[in-house]
């Protein structure tokens, strides 16, 4: 059984553990620039002209919902976007047109590493504070595919990148989130 996506009537969607995010709609107002203007991916194939590759890490910020609850703060996730390979028919920095060789290796822009983030949820009706952990993409890369690769092989996760283990601490008061209740009530 896989982890279900974090969704609210199919509107805001954040991937659950073990799932990949779909790139958000292009006109979404919460998406901002590509990191470093579309920083070059880890690319073993023709790495000389990195400006030709467009595997980008896009930051996408939104509130998460779970049932009637909403995250206390917006969460920023990273979405892997773009083609891995020279952009077809697009001029490069010095005006030449580059073509993607049809028989060349196939690269896919996919998540490379993940992090888990604990999200505090605010719920209506004086509910006890609740939390959820979501798995978010930490970085993207171009991964080379061969005819033998299938979808499941695309989904092999990168190195563990969740926050480092902290020392155990006494937990905060269980009702600590109640102070935020008024804010939530205004949201419904």
């Amino acid at each position: 059984q896989g982890w279900q996506a974090f969704r609210n009537d199919a509107t805001e969607v954040i991937p659950g553990l073990g799932e990949y995010p779909e790139p958000p709609p292009e006109n979404n107002q919460t998406m901002n620039r590509a990191e470093n203007g579309g920083r070059p991916p880890h690319h073993p194939y023709d790495a000389k002209d990195v400006s030709e590759y467009s595997c980008r890490e896009l930051h996408y910020t939104r509130f998460l919902t779970d049932g009637p609850c909403r995250s206390a703060k917006p969460v920023t996730e990273l979405v892997c976007s773009g083609q891995c390979g020279p952009a077809r028919l697009l001029p490069n920095a010095i005006g030449r047109v580059k073509w993607w060789r049809p028989n060349g290796p196939d690269f896919r822009c996919i998540p490379d590493r993940y992090r888990a983030q604990r999200v505090q949820l605010l719920c209506p009706g004086g509910a006890a504070p609740r939390s959820r952990k979501v798995r978010l993409v930490a970085s993207c890369k171009c991964k080379r595919l061969t005819r033998f690769h299938n979808q499941s092989e695309l989904k092999d996760f990168g190195p563990e990148t969740a926050r480092p283990q902290k020392g155990r601490k006494p937990r905060p008061g269980a009702r600590g989130a109640k102070a935020n209740q008024a804010e939530l009530e205004n949201a419904y």
Epitope: L17, R132, K169
Partner: antibody, heavy 118, light 107 residues
């Protein structure tokens, strides 16, 4: 494939402590919350508490406060539940469960029978 | 603590029957209710959460409804593998509490 494998059955005397382990595989334990639920013979389910292995945060049911301790070893992806000052009413099957929230139990271990008897 | 009262405590039904189990909370829990299925000698399995959302892999014959204090688990057409005990659970306020269970037996 998510799997939770618990330690074997235990027989304890009243006043003693028991420590049950739960080995998680299929994901890093710190990406989830760990829950413990018990079930007395022929009875219903009783939630004991949850812990967040990543930061050591815990929430215990008031009934078990002061008697229960939930810990984890993230290097081995193993959760532990220790219950002290045992009495006969603590005889039950103890289940570990895991999930991405503090409130629902997505995957469960097979259970560990703890018998408290003099 | 919030009490969750399930009814009936047991019922007999045949394969193909429509089965309805109810759960009543001692106070308003909004939609913070989950349902679990447990077979003898086995661990429970999550079926429904947020009162009506089916967990991954749960057959569509299982459905949940309700809000506030009254909740229902419905099995639209009982299958041989559905004979088990069903528990509701509230997670509106600590401590999370379960109903006493409803045992669904073969008629």
């Amino acid at each position: 494939q998510v799997q939770l494998v618990q330690s074997g059955a235990e027989v304890k005397k009243p006043g003693a402590s028991v420590k049950v382990s739960c080995k998680v595989s299929g994901f890093p334990i710190k990406h989830h919350f760990q829950h413990w639920v018990r079930q007395a013979p022929g009875k219903g389910l009783e939630w004991m508490g949850w812990s967040d292995p990543e930061i050591g945060d815990t929430e215990y049911a008031s009934k078990f406060q002061g008697r229960v301790t939930m810990t984890e070893d993230t290097s081995t992806d193993t959760a532990y539940m220790e219950l002290s000052s045992l009495r006969s009413e603590d005889t039950a099957v103890y289940y570990c469960a895991t999930g991405d929230t503090t409130y629902k139990f997505d995957f469960w271990g097979q259970g560990t029978t703890v018998t408290v008897s003099s | 603590d919030i009490q969750m009262t399930q009814s009936p405590s047991s019922l007999s039904a045949s394969v193909g029957d429509r089965v309805t189990i109810t759960c009543k909370a001692s106070q308003d829990v909004h939609t913070a209710v989950a349902w679990y299925q447990q077979k003898p000698g086995k661990a429970p399995k999550l079926l429904i959460y947020w009162a009506s959302t089916r967990w991954t892999g749960v057959p569509s014959r299982f459905s949940g409804s309700g809000s506030g204090t009254d909740f229902t688990l419905t099995i639209s057409s009982l299958q041989p593998e559905d004979f088990a005990t069903y528990y509701c659970q509230q997670y509106h306020d600590y401590p999370w509490t379960f109903g006493g269970g409803t045992k669904v037996e073969i008629k």
